[in-house]
């Protein structure tokens, strides 16, 4: 870290490696919860016009698709993969693509994905063909 930039104690706004290199924060779609028309498709665009700088460099992009008897919503946020989101671990946080995986939630259909390339939660993928370790 350069001498003119203070290093504060317990600073989670800055992530460094062993050489002192600094991690830049992720750029993610961040519209919180919005109504969605995404249904029965292999993939969908988020239709979120807001790309935000994640507050902490360790955060990744997350998308949550929910369908119940009344509506469909899509949530786009930044989140720290060390912490659960909607009570689920972000197990795919290192993926460059947002591959939706179904989670068990009573009373609704619930899919969630996380990823770590810029704006990767803009394109959410439901197709089974991506659910193996696809290099693309």
């Amino acid at each position: 870290i350069p001498p003119h930039v203070q290093k504060s104690v317990n600073n989670d706004m800055i992530v460094t490696d062993n050489n002192g290199a600094v991690k830049f924060p992720q750029l993610c779609k961040f519209c919180d919860v919005r109504f969605s028309t995404c249904d029965n498709q292999k993939s969908c665009m988020s239709n979120c016009s807001i790309t935000s700088i994640c507050e902490k460099p360790q955060e990744v992009c997350v998308a949550v698709w929910r369908k119940n008897d009344e509506n469909i919503t899509l949530e786009t946020v930044c989140h720290d993969p060390k912490l659960p989101y909607h009570d689920f671990i972000l197990e795919d946080a290192a993926s460059p693509k947002c591959i939706m995986k179904e989670k068990k939630k009573p009373g609704e259909t619930f899919f969630m994905c996380s990823c770590s390339s810029d704006e990767c939660n803009d394109n959410i993928i439901f197709s089974e063909e991506y659910n193996t370790s696809n290099p693309d």
Epitope: P2, A21, V22, K23, I53
Partner: nanobody, 124 residues
């Protein structure tokens, strides 16, 4: 030699405006995503805003979105930050930094060349 030189900081009252500049030299400005980053006294770094090298696509932290505007003049190798509706919590040293788009980490322990910073104080 790579240099980033920030200027334009100062004392301003709450609700006021300031325009910061960052003059870049020693590298191909149009190859880099540029950032404004700030550090309040005793706090960590906060990543304020970024702008792509070409096309001028911009990004903001939620804390400043709608109040701050980042821009760049590639012909002058200069980065700008227009800060409006300033608040006491915007008080910080403001740095500019460069990032190769797509690279998640700086190249070395000097933050891939950061400037020395310019102090912005918002107080009545």
């Amino acid at each position: 030699e790579v240099q980033l030189l920030e200027s334009g900081g100062g004392l301003v009252q709450p609700g006021g405006s300031l325009r910061l500049s960052c003059a870049a030299s020693g590298f191909t400005f149009t190859e880099y995503r540029m950032w404004w980053v700030r550090q309040a006294p005793g706090k960590g770094l906060e990543w304020v805003s970024a702008i792509e090298p070409i096309g001028n696509r911009t990004y903001y932290a939620r804390s400043v979105d709608g109040r701050f505007t980042i821009s760049r003049d590639n012909s002058k190798n200069t980065l700008y930050l227009q800060m409006n509706s300033l608040r006491a919590e915007d008080t910080a040293v403001y740095y500019c930094a460069k990032q190769i788009p797509g690279r998640k980490w700086t190249a070395n322990s000097r933050f891939d060349y950061w400037g020395q910073g310019t102090l912005v104080t918002v107080s009545s």
